[in-house]
Every structure is written in structure tokens, then in C-alpha cells.
Amino acid sequence: AVNGTSRFTCFYNSRANISCVWSQDGALQDTSCQVHAWPDRRRWNQTCELLPVSQASWACNLILGTPDSQKLTAVDIVTLRVMCREGVRWRMMAIQDFKPFENLRLMAPISLQVVHVETHRCNISWKISQASHYFERHLEFEARTLSPGHTWEEAPLMTLKQKQEWICLETLTPDTQYEFQVRVKPLQGEFTTWSPWSQPLAFRTKPAALGKD
């Protein structure tokens, strides 16, 4: 939901977490605000305390259950409200009927590891975290490699258009330090976005053998 200088944006991690950001220019920093979640077909309600992340924005995580529990489906609608304290009462500031599987952002991939490294090549694997079994294989990945003297923003993106939890990096320079990151996105959902980037994995290619290219 957006209006002028106010914005209320939430994403579902596909399992048991809805993360929300509420921003409003000119809002008082010390105002106490919460997000209330009210599903249309579940018996639970959930609340989280919005905490400041910048001058005019607040964030919180609605924890719906244990990390790998499947708390919502594609037919669920969760009414989300931003409630802020005004004196003795709570005032509703923003509202949306949230369709979880239209607003997906998965957790960053985890457990990155070097499977095999050579002078010019490196095979890396990873795992997805807290991703719904509903996706089956309908996921895609983006990866990037940080080369010496460059920034992450300059790194070209490699796209994996299928659920492939490994990559073979080629044309690398021998005896060189690199870093690698990957992110994931389900194919489902009108407002679905990429996960955060994984923690970078540092690796070094093997030195070239003496007397060889």
C-alpha cells in the first residue's frame, strides 16, 4: 500500500515468516507501532513490534511458527494492519489484504561450499533455506563472482533458470582470491522478488603448475 509519503510493504518467506516495512515521512521516531496479522481462514493472529531501521522507516518480522512449518497457502489472505499508539488509543495507519504467495521473498541461500577447485575452475554448491515444498522445482537463481579490483555491483550476473543448487565457475585466473554469492526467487507471484544475497563464500583458485599455462 502506498500513499504520498507513506508505504507499507510485506513479503512472505514461503514458510512461517512475514517481514514488513512501514515508512512514513514526518512520523515521530518514538511512536510505538505494531503490525497485526489477521488471516481469513486460520485460527491464529500474530503481532510484531515495528522497530526503526532508518529516519522514517520501521520493520518487523511476523513469526508464524517454527521456521520450516508451512503456515500459509496460496488461497490464504492475511489482513495486515499497521497500528500506532496515539495517546491512550491505537490508530490504524495502513492496511492491506496480503496474498502470501503473490508476495514472496525467500531466505538467502545457505551452506555455500567449494565442492572442487582447480586453476581455472571452481565448483560451488549451496542449499535453499525455509523454502516451501509447494514450489517443487519452480525456482530460479542468480549468482555473481567478485574478482580482485572490482565491486559486487560490477560483477556480471549469472542466471540459473532452474532449481540447480550448484554452479561451475570457469575461466578463472590461477592463484586468485574470489568471492561468490547466490540468491533465489520462486517463479510464482506477481510481486515476488529476489531473496537477499547469500553470505559471500571466499575461495582461491589453485596456482598454475610450473612450466604450464
Partner: nanobody, 126 residues
Framework: EVQLVESGGGLVQAGGSLRLSCAAS????????MAWFRQVPGMERELVAA????????VYRDSVKGRFTISRDNSKNTVYLQMNTLKPEDTAIYVC???????????????????WGQGTQVTVSS
Amino acid sequence: EVQLVESGGGLVQAGGSLRLSCAASGSIFSINAMAWFRQVPGMERELVAAISRDGGASVYRDSVKGRFTISRDNSKNTVYLQMNTLKPEDTAIYVCAATRAIGWTARWITTDFDFWGQGTQVTVSS
């Protein structure tokens, strides 16, 4: 602050029609969704219909769907409730409400609204 004044209520026979109006004044730039609620003495106030700021979205309680129509004329700062095929069970005080909150839901509740009118009586006789 926003002031809401309702009009158009009255006594009507079952099967008849009425058109309620709710005129807003004051800090109307802050208003987003508007709604009509109704209340029968001794009962909780219930949502009848709501409409978004631009009029593009609306929601109705099941018992009035197909009979009542909510509309909005922002140039006149007025919201209307056209009530057709009225039934005795529609008898109530009809109250206009407005919220400053951004966004939209199909599940409005009383506490979502910041401003309230005084209400207008609708009586449907059989």
C-alpha cells in the same frame, strides 16, 4: 479534523428505496476509504459497505449485496449509499465513517475508522 454529516434517512415501505448522503468537510485531503455502518439498539455496529479513495474498490456485507450500492463523488466530498429493495431488517441508524489509513481491505472493522458522523435513521415498515 474531519466532519461527516449524513442525510437522506427516513421511513419507507418494504421494497422501497432510499439514497443516503454523507458530506465530508475539514481536513478532507487526509481521507482515504469511507464506509457506511449501521447500528440497531443493543447490537454491535456492523459494516454495510465501504469504498476506496478513488472509488475503484468497494465491499459489501453479504445481506445487502445486489440491493445496496456505495459510490463517491470526490468533487463534492460526498459518499452515497443507494438502498433498493429495502427490507424490515435493514431498519437501523446508518452512520458514515472515514479513515486516514492508507491501503484497502475487504475486511474493514469499526476500529479502522478515525471519523464518524452522527447517523441518520432508516426505518423500513412491512
